[in-house]
């Protein structure tokens, strides 16, 4: 019952242009180009998009016109390969142009950069932004798409259209408000934070598909959709999983027009069949397309049916377990995952996948044994330690978070992770540990039943950031091992790492701990990052430093910054007091 079986179209580009409409077509082509050629100037991309759009219009008028029968990858790839400065700007990526489709597109994908060397986006004054918005609304919004897409090359394109719509609405409303800044800035902050979270979540989906394959993604989707739609039948969930997998496979492989089109079809299907899917979809389905798709993706879990029987009957006690498993292994395991997940909205998806893996391993072993039933009879007992491990970890860390508050909790994680993987670059350790630390504010406020899905699935997203950043410049075998061995065991793998005893401490460099008056004008967040960067460097110099030693040094450092920022001659204070601080810190840490 796949919703995506369409007749073959004479012209794929005309088909997508008609389905999506000119505005969405242009926006999606811009996103696609910016995600591939992340260093190209805005004007160059706009020119390429306009050329593609004009070509698409000729194909809409006559699908038999020259080149209209070419695949989108061929058309887009040919267009990207016309960029004059390709080799100078992108180096070996230019070699992709010597290949033909589909190999060329795969080559382009491989050169997407998760951490492009681009300047940080600085927000101009509100009046400057409002003037730019009023002067040329279309260019202003295109620029937003371009800047986000090039910095987040795996951002979920149809969702970026939704963010752009909200961005436009914020400026439309706030630029006419009495206090423009008070109206606009909180909205932009929210969009920025939501956007970063959305990007990271999608990056995990793409990593799952690209590094672990479709089966891994489908297993994740079965578990998550079964928790969300526990009243839906297995066949319905399977159909949604198949369609959702197609959508994400397309977006993750740069097929953004197909992805957006198929996502719209999926939303339409879900809303037309909500009676057999979930009672929570009504409000979502009344919204316009972009809001509808976003709303469905975020919809709360439906209530569990009241009369669900014990799982043991079908999956442990039945004499047909091995027969059913042998007949269709993935279907039977899918049913197990569906049944377990719909009964456990209180478990993280990754825990559910670990349980399913344990069940699979047990059946593989037991169905070849002399007495299979005797062999797998106690399989559910094997689940207990797997369930308790994340429960205990979350309990301990939420207690620590409540005791320390977010900033100091982040610092505890910074120290913990720097000791585990000290070879990782300091900016990556700071970024990842800060994000890991946000799990406290995000999840510890929840009741017990919601803590684990919130915390462990969020940690999976953050650890994937570490994995993709590390993959670009691998420096630690331990990180590589945890990132590549098992998608669902990444978090337990990192949790289990102890201090790296093989690490040779970094040479002490006073320059790393030299600060200037500019720190005084930084925002609180930026000041925290400076201090956390220093903390990571300290641990890299002295991995065996105790918590107490590090705390003493960090307290001295905070006092030093506060004192010098109040001084009349700030720069002199930083120079003189800084030397004393470095000497005192070296003494305290025995450096």
């Amino acid at each position: 019952r796949g919703v995506f079986r369409r007749d073959a179209h004479k012209s794929e580009v005309a088909h997508r242009f008609k389905d999506l409409g000119e505005e969405n077509f242009k926006a999606l082509v811009l996103i696609a180009f910016a995600q591939y050629l992340q260093q190209c100037p805005f004007e160059d991309h706009v020119k390429l998009v306009n050329e593609v759009t004009e070509f698409a219009k000729t194909c809409v008028a006559d699908e038999s016109a020259e080149n209209c029968d070419k695949s989108l990858h061929t058309l887009f790839g040919d267009k990207l390969c016309t960029v004059a400065t390709l080799r100078e700007t992108y180096g070996e990526m230019a070699d992709c142009c010597a290949k033909q489709e589909p190999e060329r597109n795969e080559c382009f994908l491989q050169h997407k950069d998760d951490n492009p060397n681009l300047p940080r986006l600085v927000r101009p004054e509100v009046d400057v932004m409002c003037t730019a918005f009023h002067d040329n609304e279309e260019t202003f919004l295109k620029k937003y798409l371009y800047e986000i897409a090039r910095r987040h090359p795996y951002f979920y394109a149809p969702e970026l259209l939704f963010f752009a719509k909200r961005y436009k609405a914020a400026f439309t409303e706030c630029c006419q408000a009495a206090d423009k800044a008070a109206c606009l800035l909180p909205k932009l902050d929210e969009l920025r934070d939501e956007g970063k979270a959305s990007s990271a979540k999608q990056r995990l989906k793409c990593a799952s598909l690209q590094k672990f394959g479709e089966r891994a993604f489908k297993a994740w989707a079965v578990a998550r959709l079964s928790q969300r739609f526990p009243k839906a039948e297995f066949a319905e969930v399977s159909k949604l999983v198949t369609d959702l997998t197609k959508v994400h496979t397309e977006c993750c492989h740069g097929d953004l027009l197909e992805c957006a089109d198929d996502r719209a079809d999926l939303a339409k299907y879900i809303c037309e069949n909500q009676d057999s899917i979930s009672s929570k979809l009504k409000e979502c389905c009344e919204k316009p397309l972009l809001e509808k798709s976003h709303c469905i993706a975020e919809v709360e879990n439906d209530e569990m049916p009241a009369d669900l029987p014990s799982l043991a009957a079908d999956f442990v006690e039945s004499k047909d377990v091995c027969k059913n498993y042998a007949e269709a292994k993935d279907v039977f395991l899918g049913m197990f995952l569906y049944e377990y997940a719909r009964r456990h909205p209180d478990y993280s998806v990754v825990l559910l996948l670990r349980l399913a893996k344990t069940y699979e391993t047990t059946l593989e072993k037991c169905c070849a044994a002399a007495d299979p039933h005797e062999c797998y009879a106690k399989v559910f007992d094997e689940f207990k330690p797997l369930v308790e491990e994340p429960q205990n970890l979350i309990k301990q860390n939420c207690e620590l978070f409540e005791q320390l508050g977010e900033y100091k909790f982040q610092n505890a994680l910074l120290v913990r992770y720097t000791k585990k993987v000290p070879q990782v670059s300091t900016p990556t350790l700071v970024e990842v540990s800060r994000n890991l630390g946000k799990v406290g504010s995000k999840c510890c406020k929840h009741p017990e039943a919601k803590r684990m899905p919130c915390a462990e699935d969020y940690l999976s997203v953050v650890l994937n950031q570490l994995c993709v950043l590390h993959e670009k410049t691998p420096v630690s075998d331990r990180v590589t091992k945890c990132c590549t061995e098992s998608l669902v065991n990444r978090r337990p793998c990192f949790s289990a790492l102890e201090v790296d005893e093989t690490y040779v401490p970094k040479e002490f460099n006073a320059e790393t701990f030299t600060f200037h008056a500019d720190i005084c004008t930084l925002s609180e967040k930026e000041r925290q990052i400076k201090k956390q960067t220093a903390l990571v460097e300290l641990v890299k110099h002295k991995p065996k430093a105790t918590k107490e030693q590090l705390k003493a040094v960090m307290d001295d450092f905070a006092a030093f910054v506060e004192k010098c920022c109040k001084a009349d001659d700030k720069e002199t204070c930083f120079a003189e007091e800084g030397k004393k601080l470095v000497a005192a810190s070296q003494a305290a840490l025995g450096l």
Epitope: T74, E101, E103, R104, N105, L209, G213
Partner: nanobody
Framework: QVQLVESGGGLVQPGGSLRLSCAAS??????MGWFRQAAGKEREFVAS????????RYGDSVKGRFTISRDNTKSSLYLQMNSLKPEDTAVYYC???????????WGQGTQVTVSS
Amino acid sequence: QVQLVESGGGLVQPGGSLRLSCAASGLPSRVMGWFRQAAGKEREFVASISVSGIDTRYGDSVKGRFTISRDNTKSSLYLQMNSLKPEDTAVYYCAATDGQGNYRHWGQGTQVTVSS
């Protein structure tokens, strides 16, 4: 660790059809393709397919007669060969890329013979 195993080859009469299969293991989703090598000739590109199956490409000599497809759930690649000709006789190889569009992983091959 990466394994590609072809099957489905055999003897077929001119004008007949065959369906080749390739089972892949130890490999995430990649662009995949079919190549062939006739006795005493260079290896020749037959067809390739993108991960999502959206994009396919064919060698000039097989266009309109052969169809490449894949089933990612089964990690399988297929080649449906219709209107076979004697010049299609060759060992057919399944191949997968390294993720950068370069074919690095190869199967052992399956023999296809078109003869009356």
